[in-house]
């Protein structure tokens, strides 16, 4: 199925040019999306091209500049947040990145009613997190690992926590491992719906081993970065959840929410918090051995000013074939009765589907079913449930938005997006206004992305928010590669693949093949999305065929495929890449003497193992920031899939699945190993150990490090990286420069 057919006739071909590496590095063909910043059922904010903050009212069609670019510029603001009472805006400047989601910044509060910055009781700097209450203009913020509360922006702050300490106690913000592997946010505090209560997590990292690495900087001596980072089997953070009444914060102070007994009996994690009403909260907990999750609904006891979590309101989710959930355990979406909820989990056939839980999980009513998966619940209203799935036409790499009418019986299902722009748009996400009065659809491809606004009642398209016209025009004279998404059936396993083919692809010719792999548990690489990136250039200009394959362990095709890698990382992911390569060779247009594989992070691990598989299939390959041993990676992630590195658990496979154990097998391949020295995520240690093992085995290899760069290898390093990898591949494939 050719998803991006060439738009060219032969007569026009001489006016067309191939993509260049410069195009990719300059971001010449990047696209824009439009996500409205909803502030009501019919209004949203958007930062205009000239940096004014504009409020749009869909119903009246009017727009209002609520904050001028002049005001934004006066404090060098790069972000903003309107208070729910619309009296104030916080302006964020001096952005300083920390980890994946976290950053610190300076915050200024601007009073919209008098057009002046709030003076007196200004916020300290730098702040780790700041947010408005959902109603009014209370402020909660985290400074130096402690939480503070302001009733109004100009008021003095009330300090909620006092024990915060760098790298020891984190209040209202996650530590490294919770940020990266559990919460996927920079915050760990949650306002109740009307701002009466504030819940927060406290993470105690006192006993966690510390990863230390040098940051070279420009000084005479490098400084050492220390991060409490629990690797597999190590001591984990200790988490506690507290709730404070923000109206009278000093009255009883923070109240701890009890942990369910079946969770508290051994090491555990807190996984998410969902407010239901101002006086009901839902917490999710997970055993350290991550196949048991407990959802606990707790109620405020006015008489005792405490939170009560009755056992009758505990819902257990357990996996017998793998870990609980997909990548994370799904979160509940509560219905209007404030006790029943909708949640995605595996059905009896092993497909993730929406279930409605009224009393017990055992009595859950299955809302969706089929040999496909429900992926996200966007919104539940009185009469509709909006969700995304990959059901349509049985392509796992697509995402369409569906509406189920829950107000009527039997519920009826409608695909909102399936036939909107069928060729252009097969991968959607959505963003809903209050009460789903309106919603924005963001289509990511396979054609040029487009964002549109829709009526939440009729699903009628109201207007195009962003259609990337300039990109469309810029691509008119570019010879883009062709892309196809197909599947291989091998030994009862379906291997979906995406193949990126040179513009003048001819099946009778032979082409070098590059496999791009990620392959991590619950990931998906074969998606119907638009991209003009490095591999597009390699196909367009350098005439390579590039393939991406979703093997065992990948997501959204059922538990059989997903959980196949449970406790056995590094085996089937690699096997399936190799199997796919053999099938590609059989197709007749691959030059089997010129096959390479590359990947980043988990993909670096898989590419390394594939190169060291001893098959003789690969001439060369690249590993960027690879994991080399699961003993070196974070506990939360690693143990989810591998269990513990102990003798009585899974130590043997931890040892067997290292890259170092296969050092000898790199002798007959060209290997390029790349890593940033300041990688907080997959530590440089991983590549250092690979290099040491290769040296000890007297195996030649190439390597590149990026000083002071993290897992993303951003900025100028990106240009250097892709230039370097291009040279390596062209040399490997004997392509002239």
């Amino acid at each position: 199925i050719v998803l991006r057919p060439s738009r060219v006739h032969n007569s026009e071909e001489n006016t067309m040019r191939a993509l260049t590496l410069k195009d990719i590095l300059n971001g010449t063909f990047s696209y824009k999306t439009f996500f409205p910043n909803w502030i009501s059922g019919q209004e949203y904010l958007h930062q205009s091209a000239d940096n004014n903050i504009v409020l749009y009212n869909i119903e009246t069609g009017q727009s209002y500049t609520i904050l001028s670019n002049r005001t934004m510029k006066s404090v060098n603001a790069s972000n903003y947040g309107l208070s729910p009472d619309r009296q104030f805006v916080y302006l964020e400047s001096d952005y300083s990145k920390l980890w994946r989601y976290s950053y610190t910044a300076t915050y200024y509060i601007y009073d919209l009613s008098n057009g002046e910055f709030v003076r007196g009781n200004e916020l300290p700097r730098p702040i780790q997190y700041l947010c408005w209450s959902p109603v009014g203009s209370k402020l909660a913020y985290v400074y130096q690992n402690n939480i503070y509360l302001k009733q109004r922006p100009g008021d003095p702050p009330f300090q909620i926590t006092f024990n915060g300490r760098e790298n020891k106690i984190f209040n209202g913000i996650p530590d490294w491992v919770y940020e990266e592997e559990m919460l996927a946010t920079k915050y760990a505090l949650w306002w109740s719906p009307n701002g009466k209560f504030l819940a927060y997590a406290e993470f105690n990292d006192t006993d966690i081993p510390v990863i230390a690495y040098s940051y070279y900087g420009d000084e005479q001596y490098p400084r050492t970065i220390n991060i409490p980072y629990p690797k597999a089997g190590a001591k984990n953070p200790v988490v506690r959840i507290f709730i404070i009444d923000t109206t009278y914060p000093a009255y009883v102070g923070p109240q701890e929410v009890p942990v369910p007994a079946m969770i508290a009996s051994s090491d555990y994690y807190f996984s998410w918090l969902t407010w239901v009403t101002d006086e009901r909260v839902c917490l999710q907990w997970l055993k350290r051995v991550q196949n048991v999750s407990v959802l606990s609904i707790c109620d405020f006891r006015e008489d005792w000013q405490t939170w009560d979590c009755p056992k009758t309101q505990e819902h257990i989710e357990e996996s017998r074939t793998g870990w609980a959930g997909g990548f994370f355990v799904s979160t509940p979406v509560f219905s209007y009765d404030a006790i029943s909820y909708y949640k995605i989990f595996s059905d009896k056939d092993g497909y993730k589907h929406i279930h409605y839980i009224k009393d017990t999980v055992e009595n859950a009513i299955q809302i969706t079913s089929g040999k496909w998966e429900a992926i996200n619940i966007f919104r539940v209203t009185q009469d509709s449930l909006f969700y995304s799935s990959n059901e349509f036409e049985e392509y796992p790499g697509r995402r369409n938005i569906y509406r189920i009418s829950i107000g009527s019986y039997p519920p009826s299902k409608k695909c909102v997006t399936c036939h909107l722009r069928k060729e252009r748009c097969q991968y959607y996400t959505a963003s809903f206004s209050d009460y789903a009065k309106y919603y924005a659809l963001v289509c990511y491809g396979p054609g040029i992305p487009i964002s549109t606004l829709h009526d939440g009642r009729t699903d009628q398209e109201i207007k195009i928010l962003e259609e990337n016209k300039e990109l469309e025009n810029a691509l008119k004279n570019i010879q883009l590669p062709k892309e196809e998404i197909k599947k291989l059936e091998v030994d009862e396993i379906t291997l979906w693949y995406k193949m990126i083919l040179p513009p003048q692809f001819d099946r009778s010719k032979k082409y070098p093949l590059l496999i791009q792999v990620y392959g991590g548990p619950c990931s998906q690489s074969v998606r119907s999305v638009f991209a003009v990136n490095w591999i597009s250039y390699l196909a367009s200009k350098e005439g390579m065929v590039i393939a991406l394959v979703d093997g065992r362990g990948t997501a959204f095709q059922g538990d059989k495929l997903l959980y196949a890698v449970y406790r056995k990382l590094g085996v089937y992911e690699v096997e399936d890449q190799i199997t796919a390569v053999r099938k590609f060779i059989e197709m007749g247009f691959i030059d089997e003497k010129r096959i390479a594989i590359w990947g980043w992070s988990y993909g670096g691990y898989v590419s390394s193992l594939a190169l060291a598989s001893g098959t003789g299939l690969f001439k060369c390959g690249i590993a960027v920031a690879p994991v080399s041993s699961w003993e070196y990676y974070a506990s939360v992630y690693t143990e989810r899939f591998m269990g513990l590195p102990t003798k009585d658990d899974n130590l043997e496979h931890y040892k067997n699945s290292t890259v170092m154990a296969r050092a000898e097998y790199f002798r007959n391949v060209d290997y390029l190993l790349i890593h940033g020295t300041a990688d907080d995520n997959v530590h440089f240690q991983n590549s250092a150990q690979i290099a040491k093992a290769l040296v000890n085995a007297q195996v030649d290899f190439q390597a590149m490090w990026y000083s002071d760069q993290n897992h993303g290898l951003s900025g100028l390093s990106t240009n250097h990286l892709y230039t370097h990898m291009t040279h390596f591949l062209k040399q490997c494939f004997s392509l002239s420069d």
């Epitope: 059922g41 009212n57 727009s63 209002y64 619309r86 009613s113 109603v135």
Partner: antibody, heavy 119, light 107 residues
Framework: QVQLVQSGAEVKKPGSSVKVSCKAS????????INWVRQAPGQGLEWMGL???????NYNQKFQGRVTITKDNSTSTAYMELSSLRSEDTAVYYC?????????????WGQGTLVTVSS | DIQMTQSPSSLSASVGDRVTITCKAS??????VAWYQQKPGKAPKLLIY???YRYTGVPSRFSGSGSGTDFTLTISSLQPEDFATYYC?????????FGQGTKVEIK
């Protein structure tokens, strides 16, 4: 600071028209709606209509065909014209600022213009 | 049109009293209700918008609540300068409509 200054009192004959002006300062008419509200002697408040930031209008059905609201952004002045005047149109007419920051409630009021319709 | 019915139409109270004025909408107006204060010979002044948000500079003794069809304006401790007429208004849809007013007089 924000101000809405209205034109002076008017005495009009039944059947004639009146045009009340409202000069805005401290804000731009391209960024706020201007509403017109009237109050008959000893009576309550009655919303007549508005002119949006973009220049579009919305009128109370009760006045449809008789009221016209316009504005001149360059002079920051809004106007309300009421035709076919009757004695019951005797009232104080207010121009009032509205906008999204107060959920389209009416936050700044002019001082009012008394229009007397009398033969 | 949406009708706004205010009650009482007048009330007598003393300084320091807690005063409550209610307003009922003929249909659901969500939280789009504002309250105004008007003194004789003067233009009305905005007190509360979106049912519960106090407008800038309005004393904290004034508070608003409600959603849907039932709304309340409360003056927690009546001050001499609070004797005036109070109006509710829905700003949910056009035409914007006002309640008939509540006159707060000195007892």
């Amino acid at each position: 600071q924000v101000q809405l200054v209205q034109s002076g009192a008017e005495v009009k004959k039944p059947g004639s028209s009146v045009k009340v002006s409202c000069k805005a300062s401290g804000f731009s008419l391209t960024n706020y709606d201007i509403n017109w509200v009237r109050q008959a002697p000893g009576q309550g408040l009655e919303w007549m209509g508005l002119i949006w930031t973009g220049g579009g209008t919305n009128y109370n059905q009760k006045f449809q065909g008789r009221v016209t609201i316009t504005k001149d952004n360059s002079t920051s002045t809004a106007y309300m014209e009421l035709s076919s005047l009757r004695s019951e149109d005797t009232a104080v007419y207010y121009c009032v600022r509205g906008g999204p920051l107060v959920w389209y409630a009416l936050d700044y009021w002019g001082q009012g213009t008394l229009v007397t319709v009398s033969s | 049109d949406i009708q706004m019915t205010q009650s009482p139409s007048s009330l007598s109270a003393s300084v320091g009293d807690r005063v409550t004025i209610t307003c009922k909408a003929s249909q659901d107006v969500s939280t789009a209700v504002a309250w105004y204060q008007q003194k004789p010979g003067k233009a009305p002044k905005l007190l509360i918008y979106s049912a519960s948000y106090r407008y800038t500079g309005v004393p904290s003794r004034f508070s608003g609540s409600g959603s849907g069809t039932d709304f309340t304006l409360t003056i927690s401790s009546l001050q001499p300068e609070d004797f005036a007429t109070y109006y509710c208004q829905q700003h949910y849809s056009n035409p914007r409509t006002f309640g008939q007013g509540t006159k707060v007089e000195i007892k």
